[in-house]
Structures are given as structure tokens and as C-alpha cells.
């Protein structure tokens, strides 16, 4: 059993959020993937998605968000460059699989962006800022709109929830059930 968790990233304005979402490559290698934000009391909002079918190692850029799907490795790389305070929020990767509901990938990212500058995450104090040049070959993909009433309509609690689930992805239909489970700190 695996656990539905949420990781808190505390970054400064101007820095880059650079994360990986791993998925079962046998199931989802070419499926369309998306990066979503979940605002309190709202439906998840898709900010960017890969092409359909998802192309291998082909960067897709939407504004300050760059997605790169590595099929061979079962990894989606998500970069949000030049972070702003208003980017703070809860994010998740999902896999689109119409006509079924999207699958959510672990782990969710709670991003907290504050004013002021410091080094990149995991770096020491005198590290230089991680500035990403936008790849020149990026393309923009159209993302499907999922407005099913069965998807999550409530943001999960702000602390990490330990919830067992048998696979590395869960169907969003189940999220409302999952978030009612007590939270263990």
C-alpha cells in the first residue's frame, strides 16, 4: 500500500519549482498528462498539459510552466519558472484517460512562495539562482476541460494525509472519500 501525501515546497520569488511526477509507464506512457492547481473549495484547474498522445521528451510550455514527459522513464517533469507569490497553492499531476475520470499522481505539491531571494531548493546559502531558459522548441497543447461533478470539489487538508491505496495512481472520483480520512501528523 502506498500513501497519499503532500509535500510542502517553500521557495522565493524568482526561483523555479522543478518536480517529477512518476507514473506506471506500462499503463500511461503515451497518455496525456496535466498540471493542475487546487484552490480551496474549487474544482482542480488545469494549468498546462502535454499533447495527446503525449510525445516523448518533447517540452510543452504554457506561460511560465514547462512540462516534459519522459515515456521510457515513467516520469513527467514539471517546471514553474520565475515564481510569484500568487503562485502559492496546492498542485497535482493528473493523467487524462477519457472517457474515464483523470488519475491523480502522487505526491501533491503545496507550494509556498515568499518575497525575497535565496538559493535554489536543496542548495546552500551561496548558491546561484536557478534561472531556466525556455527551450526554443516548446509547443503549446490544448487541454481538455473536465467538469464532471464527480471530481474533487473540496481541497484536501493542509497537512499531510497518510492514506493507503493499492496503486501508484488513484482515480479522482475517489478523492472526496480519501480526504475525509483523519489526518495523521
Amino acid at each position: 500500500a502506498t500513501k497519499l501525501t503532500e509535500e510542502k515546497y517553500e521557495l522565493k520569488e524568482g526561483q523555479t519549482l522543478d518536480v517529477k511526477c512518476d507514473y506506471t509507464l506500462e499503463k500511461f506512457a503515451s497518455s496525456q498528462k496535466a498540471w493542475q492547481i487546487i484552490r480551496d473549495g474549487e474544482m482542480p484547474k488545469t494549468l498546462a498539459c502535454t499533447e495527446r498522445p503525449s510525445k516523448n521528451s518533447h517540452p510543452v510550455q504554457v506561460g511560465r510552466i514547462i512540462l516534459e514527459d519522459y515515456h521510457d522513464h515513467g516520469l513527467l517533469r514539471v517546471r514553474m519558472v520565475n515564481l510569484q507569490v500568487e503562485d502559492s497553492g496546492l498542485y497535482q499531476c493528473v493523467i487524462y484517460q477519457p472517457p474515464k475520470e483523470p488519475h491523480m499522481l502522487f505526491d501533491r505539491i503545496r507550494l509556498v512562495v515568499t518575497k525575497g531571494f535565496s538559493g535554489t531548493p536543496g542548495s546552500n546559502e551561496n548558491s546561484t539562482q536557478n534561472v531556466y531558459k525556455i527551450p526554443p522548441t516548446t509547443t503549446k497543447a490544448l487541454c481538455p476541460l473536465y467538469t464532471s461533478p464527480r471530481t474533487v470539489t473540496q481541497a484536501p487538508p493542509k497537512s499531510t494525509a497518510d492514506v493507503s491505496t493499492p496503486d501508484s495512481e488513484i482515480n479522482l472520483t475517489n478523492v472526496t472519500d480519501i480526504i475525509r480520512v483523519p489526518v495523521f501528523n
Partner: antibody, heavy 124, light 107 residues
Framework: QVQLVQSGAEVKKPGASVKVSCKAS????????INWVRQATGQGLEWMGW????????GYVKKFQGRVTMTRDTSISTAYMELSSLRSEDTAVYYC?????????????????WGRGTLVTVSS | DTQMTQSPSSLSASVGDRVTITCQAS??????LNWYQEKPGKAPKLLIY???NLETGVPSRFSGSGSGTDFTFTISSLQPEDIATYYC?????????FGGGTKVEIK
């Protein structure tokens, strides 16, 4: 102490398979991805792929796909790498390595803890 | 795949010398580069991560710099225990790839 202990040297014939084990101790096995890197005699380092011990998800470098399988047994904190259809050019030292990341999901590929390596010799 | 060209492939220097190794990526890898030290019969050891950050416990005579495609690894004052092969490793793109290594010897 924090360490990765690998299984002993193996001698295999071409076409056979080898399964190398990597036992973690001193840290929570399921909290860090395990990667496999090999080094042929007198050659450089070559990444083979990664595994998430928590969920069992894996990713393999294209040249090894179809021949490599990475698995784990969380009950004994052990990762395995099996390579099939062995050929002479697979003769190498195989290392397991822990991917350290400040955040579990961050795009950081630093290998801060390595096993001592397992020499696999493929010879007829 | 991103090719990592490391130079020189070997060098010989005196104790106390400043040693510089370069690594060039075939495409932009941002700051996503690490440096490792490998001694004969031992596993590689992480020295520098994310281009310029010194791993905990590593002597301050080791340093790294660079971004984009060109990176440099420096030993400010070579010590006898620094005899080893040094490798760069990029993670700006998958698959992860290593440089060919630089063997450092004492004159």
C-alpha cells in the same frame, strides 16, 4: 549505519540472466529512489534506470529496455536488478545508488549513497 | 541523449597545485550537474551537486561552477588523497549521462 549492501560477484554464460540485490539499512528504504549504474572494466559510469521502492514504479534507459527489470521487497528493504540475455559487453561492476532529494518529488538526481558494487562477468 | 564531454581524460599534477577539469554538455542542462570522485575498488562519492554546491563533509578545496553547457570542477590545492577518477553527471535531461572521467595522478 546508513549503507547499501550488494550481493556477491557472479559469473554467467552468454544468454543467461543475473539478479543483483541491494539491501538498504540505516534509513527508511521506501523514502528514497534507488538507481542502478554500471561500469565496464576501464570504462565510465552508465545509468541503467531508477525505481521508486514505495510504489514499485520504474524507468529504464532505452538501451536496456526489454532486458532489465528492477524490483524490490520492502519487507527486507532490498532492491533487485535483473539483467537477461547477457552478452560479453555486459561484463561490468553494477552499483545500486540512492537518489537523495531535499523534497521527495523534486527533480534532483544526486546519488549520495552507493553500494560497493557487484562484479558480473559474462563469459563462455 | 545529452552527451557529456569531459576533459582532460587524465592529468598529472604536483601536491598543492590547482587542478581544473571541464565538462561540456551537448545541450543546455541549466545547473543540473553533479561531480563524483571514484577511487580504485571503491564506489563513487558525491562531491558537488547542482553545479556548485559542496556536499556535506567534502573538503572546501573542491568546488564547481558553470551553467548551461559549460562546467568546471576545481581542486584548489591538490592533496595525495585526491588521486582518483572524477566524473561529471548531468540530470538536465533524461537519460542521466556521465562524462568519460578524468584520472588525476600525482607527479
Amino acid at each position: 549505519q546508513v549503507q547499501l549492501v550488494q550481493s556477491g560477484a557472479e559469473v554467467k554464460k552468454p544468454g543467461a540472466s543475473v539478479k543483483v540485490s541491494c539491501k538498504a539499512s540505516g534509513y527508511t528504504f521506501t523514502s528514497y529512489d534507488i538507481n542502478w549504474v554500471r561500469q565496464a572494466t576501464g570504462q565510465g559510469l552508465e545509468w541503467m534506470g531508477w525505481m521508486n521502492p514505495n510504489r514499485g514504479n520504474t524507468g529504464y534507459v532505452k538501451k536496456f529496455q526489454g532486458r532489465v527489470t528492477m524490483t524490490r521487497d520492502t519487507s527486507i528493504s532490498t532492491a533487485y536488478m535483473e539483467l537477461s540475455s547477457l552478452r560479453s559487453e555486459d561484463t561490468a561492476v553494477y552499483y545500486c545508488a540512492r537518489r537523495r532529494a531535499v523534497y521527495r518529488s523534486s527533480w534532483e538526481w544526486y546519488f549520495d549513497l552507493w553500494g560497493r558494487g557487484t562484479l558480473v562477468t559474462v563469459s563462455s | 541523449d545529452t552527451q557529456m564531454t569531459q576533459s582532460p581524460s587524465s592529468l598529472s599534477a604536483s601536491v598543492g597545485d590547482r587542478v581544473t577539469i571541464t565538462c561540456q554538455a551537448s545541450q543546455d542542462i541549466f545547473n543540473d550537474l553533479n561531480w563524483y570522485q571514484e577511487k580504485p575498488g571503491k564506489a563513487p562519492k558525491l562531491l558537488i551537486y547542482h553545479a556548485s554546491n559542496l556536499e556535506t563533509g567534502v573538503p572546501s578545496r573542491f568546488s564547481g561552477s558553470g551553467s548551461g553547457t559549460d562546467f568546471t570542477f576545481t581542486i584548489s590545492s591538490l592533496q595525495p588523497e585526491d588521486i582518483a577518477t572524477y566524473y561529471c553527471q548531468q540530470y538536465g535531461n533524461l537519460p542521466l549521462t556521465f562524462g568519460g572521467g578524468t584520472k588525476v595522478e600525482i607527479k
